[in-house]
């Protein structure tokens, strides 16, 4: 009878094992968007960036919805969000309207239930992009660890959104889910 | 019966902690590979830096496999890739040739089965280093979540990679695994 | 006997479940501190930052201690790290110095055992910050991989506090655990 | 057709001063770093000054270092040799010469002028 | 400063013959040295930098090698127009030094 439990054990804690790190390593939420070029807004001023791929190339999405551009999380937890934002101007482009430049990013977060919005992280640098130069380009990163509940949206707002540099390696954010609320 | 088959499970389960654990939080690949200063190589344009410590101070490796100047992928999975690069320049330094550069990082990913490079990330700035000035620094920082497989490989490509500052603290380059692949 | 035995073993294993999720995703050590700009020092040369929030905004602590201005690991293991530290000025706040800054973020760690302090990233940049403008702004993000053993400490210093953005989402820094060592 | 062409040699006195202009044409010559070259009579080459494509470092070996002075206007395409205290040893053609992209500490030279000849002799 | 030793200082070679040119840096130049062909009453032109890259336009004929502190420049087959003095220069740091030349001669 002894002999009949073990066996009987090792093949349960055997399936456990398949069981725990599936539960554990693959239903964790994340999200990696990359800009969608087709569709960046103009100014100069702070806007939101809506339009975002999460499909396609480097895009991708697991246990967290996209929608009406923003990131919508699906379940409680810490994460640790991301923003990688690239500006560029080249002379062919056309003149700048200033040569002194706010070039920003803010990562903001959104709850439903009070609507109200709020910065989680920003950064950025005034330049000064002379004509002096053909090319200029500056990336901003931006990386921190949040407490998330379900139904809070994420969205990423920035300054001068016509100077966004659209490759998919240039200008993204993202989230992973590293921990559950205690 | 009951009351040994209950002790027996504790046991069972308790030794299932340690190794769940284990097989969780230690068996997890993770790299943080830090510049090797005496092999920096020169030039102007975009080259790849092949040559990176993973065994001394900061440099560290464990289920991934350092090659030919690459990070090899041994686990499938989902992983956090960041890199740190830092650019200075003293008048002691040599004679720098302009005052407008280009500082970029590149962080790429080959696949042997299919003999191609992608880039994941991008992130630097142009830069106006002065002679008015006896010492210039710039830092880039790049993150992101990408889903990697068993034999694909990281590495990193700079321009003006002679400006590198060669500290193991300013340039650098790692990833750790997230999670599993569905 | 043995239908007996297998309803029981759902019921210790379901269990099972929700401590192992426990033990793993609740129990990992976390932080993200936010400057308290009550307690910004003065000086344009590298000092550390002692006074953080850790207990309302964003800020939070999981598992670790914050004391005297340090973050205090109290559990071995490897741990993802980060900064970010923004500088500003504006012409009401008064003439700089210097035009020619060096802004400048350390995250340095130091081990009471062995009374020693060591960087383990450094970013910045040299920043020429004119009368021309009105405003300038300038943001630095770093982040790394690190082994950390329980009693060690991390703290940060920058240069020229006193042109630190005392902004919550703007000078922050962090960490959480990612695995256990070996 | 990417082109330099120098001017102001000449005959001077031992102590005396010149000015030596480099034209540049066919290419965008702020975006390169210049420098000058001589060579003595029926010997080999020496690099003498050298600017970078803003003007804001200049570079000198000791043989000129407080004599020489190089110097550049991106608005006029033009590059400048100013040579003070001038003796025998300094009697040379002189080249204006584009420095080739590459790594930034790195200097060769891809374009040169004809030349142009400075005699020092009382 | 960095001392650049050429030799031969002169040779003479037939149309089609092989031409080997060596310099020496008294200190590391890693591959940092460049080659100009200066042609009689003519400016140098460059032809090898970085050790062993033709710049544009340069024949196949001409090629260098070398690393550290020994280089080798070579013209596979010497053409009538290839009678020149050529110069080694380093490019590894200020000042930037030329070798004393070597003038090949066509026999």
């Known amino acids: 009878g002894s002999q009949h439990i073990r066996a009987e054990k090792a093949m349960v804690d055997g399936s456990w094992l398949d069981l725990a790190k599936r539960s554990k390593l693959e239903a964790q939420p994340f999200a990696h968007l990359t800009i969608n070029a087709t569709d960046i807004p103009s100014g100069s001023h702070k806007v939101s960036l809506s339009s975002w791929y999460h499909d396609r190339g480097w895009g991708k999405i697991s246990n967290m919805t996209f929608s009406n551009g923003k990131l919508i999380v699906n379940q409680d937890g810490f994460y640790y969000l991301y923003a990688n934002i690239c500006f560029r101007h080249h002379e062919t482009s056309g003149d700048l309207a200033t040569e002194y430049l706010q070039l920003m990013v803010y990562v903001t977060k959104t709850s439903i239930k009070i609507p109200s919005s709020h910065t989680l992280m920003k950064g950025g640098s005034t330049k000064y992009w002379s004509g002096n130069s053909e090319f200029h380009f500056y990336s901003i990163n931006v990386g921190g660890f949040f407490k998330l509940r379900s139904g809070e949206e994420i969205s990423i707002e920035v300054s001068n959104p016509s100077l966004l540099d659209p490759d998919q390696d240039a200008t993204y954010f993202g989230a992973f889910k590293v921990r559950d609320i205690d | 019966g009951s009351q040994h088959i209950r002790a027996e499970k504790a046991m069972v389960d308790g030794s299932w902690l340690d190794l769940a654990k284990r097989s969780k939080l230690e068996a997890q690949p993770f790299a943080h590979l830090t510049i090797n200063a005496t092999d920096i190589p020169s030039g102007s344009h975009k080259v790849s830096l092949s040559s990176w410590y993973h065994d001394r101070g900061w440099g560290k490796i464990s289920n991934m496999t350092f090659s030919n100047g690459k990070l090899i992928v041994n686990q499938d999975g989902f992983y956090y890739l960041y890199a740190n690069i830092c650019f200075r320049h003293h008048e002691t330094s040599g004679d720098l040739a302009t005052e407008y550069l280009q500082l970029m990082v590149y962080v790429t990913k080959t696949s042997i089965k299919i003999p191609s490079s992608h880039t994941l990330m991008k992130g630097g700035s142009t830069k106006y280093w002065s002679g008015n000035s006896e010492f210039h620094f710039y830092s880039i920082n790049v993150g992101g979540f990408f889903k990697l497989r068993s034999g694909e490989e990281i590495s990193i490509e700079v321009s003006n990679p002679s400006l590198l500052d060669p500290d193991q603290d300013a340039t650098y380059f790692g990833a750790f695994k997230v999670r599993d692949i569905d | 006997g043995s239908q007996h035995i297998r309803a029981e073993k759902a019921m210790v294993d379901g269990s099972w479940l929700d401590l192992a999720k426990r033990s793993k995703l609740e129990a990992q050590p976390f932080a993200h501190l936010t400057i308290n700009a009550t307690d910004i020092p003065s000086g344009s040369h590298k000092v550390s930052l002692s006074s953080w929030y850790h207990d309302r905004g964003w800020g939070k602590i999981s598992n670790m201690t914050f004391s005297n201005g340090k973050l205090i690991v109290n559990q071995d293991g490897f741990y993802y790290l980060y900064a970010n530290i923004c500088f500003r000025h504006h012409e009401t706040s008064g003439d700089l110095a210097t035009e020619y800054l060096q802004l400048m973020v350390y995250v340095t760690k130091t081990s009471i055992k062995i009374p020693s302090s060591h960087t383990l990233m450094k970013g910045g940049s040299t920043k020429y910050w004119s009368g021309n403008s009105e405003f300038h702004f300038y943001s630095i993000n770093v982040g790394g991989f690190f082994k950390l053993r329980s009693g060690e400490e991390i703290s940060i210093e920058v240069s020229n506090p006193s042109l630190l953005d005392p902004d919550q989402d703007a000078t922050y820094f962090g960490a959480f655990k990612v695995r256990d060592i070996d | 057709e990417v082109q330099l062409v120098e001017s102001g040699g000449g005959l001077v006195k031992p102590g005396g001063s010149l000015r030596l202009s480099c034209a540049a044409s066919?290419?965008?010559?702020?975006?390169?770093?210049m420098s000058w070259v001589r060579q003595a009579p029926g010997k080999g080459l020496e690099w003498v000054a050298g600017?970078?494509?803003?003007?804001?470092?200049?570079y000198y070996p000791d043989t000129v270092k407080g004599r020489f002075t190089i110097s550049r206007d991106n608005a006029k395409n033009s590059l400048y040799l100013q040579m003070n205290s001038l003796r025998a040893e300094d009697t040379a053609v002189y080249y204006c010469?584009?420095?080739?992209?590459?790594?930034?500490?790195?200097?060769?030279?891809?374009?040169w002028g004809k030349g142009t000849t400075v005699t020092v002799s009382s | 400063d960095i001392q650049m030793t050429q030799s031969p200082s002169s040779l003479s070679a037939s149309v089609g013959d092989r031409v080997t040119i060596t310099c020496k840096a008294s200190?590391?130049?890693?591959?940092?040295i460049a080659w100009y062909q200066q042609k009689p009453g003519k400016s140098p032109k460059l032809l090898i930098y970085?050790?062993?890259y033709r710049y544009t336009g340069v024949p196949s004929r001409f090629s260098g090698s070398g690393s550290g502190t020994d280089f080798t420049f070579t013209i596979s087959s010497l053409q009538p127009e290839d009678l020149a003095t050529y110069y080694c220069?380093?490019?590894?740091?200020?000042?930037?030094?030329f070798g004393g030349g070597t003038k090949v001669e066509i026999k």
């Open positions: 970085s050790a062993s």
């Open positions: 600017i970078s494509s803003g003007g804001t470092y200049t």
């Open positions: 200190q590391d130049v890693r591959t940092s």
């Open positions: 010469a584009r420095r080739d992209y590459g790594d930034v500490y790195e200097w060769y030279f891809d374009v």
């Open positions: 066919g290419f965008t010559f702020r975006n390169y770093a």
């Open positions: 220069q380093q490019h590894y740091s200020s000042p930037w030094t």
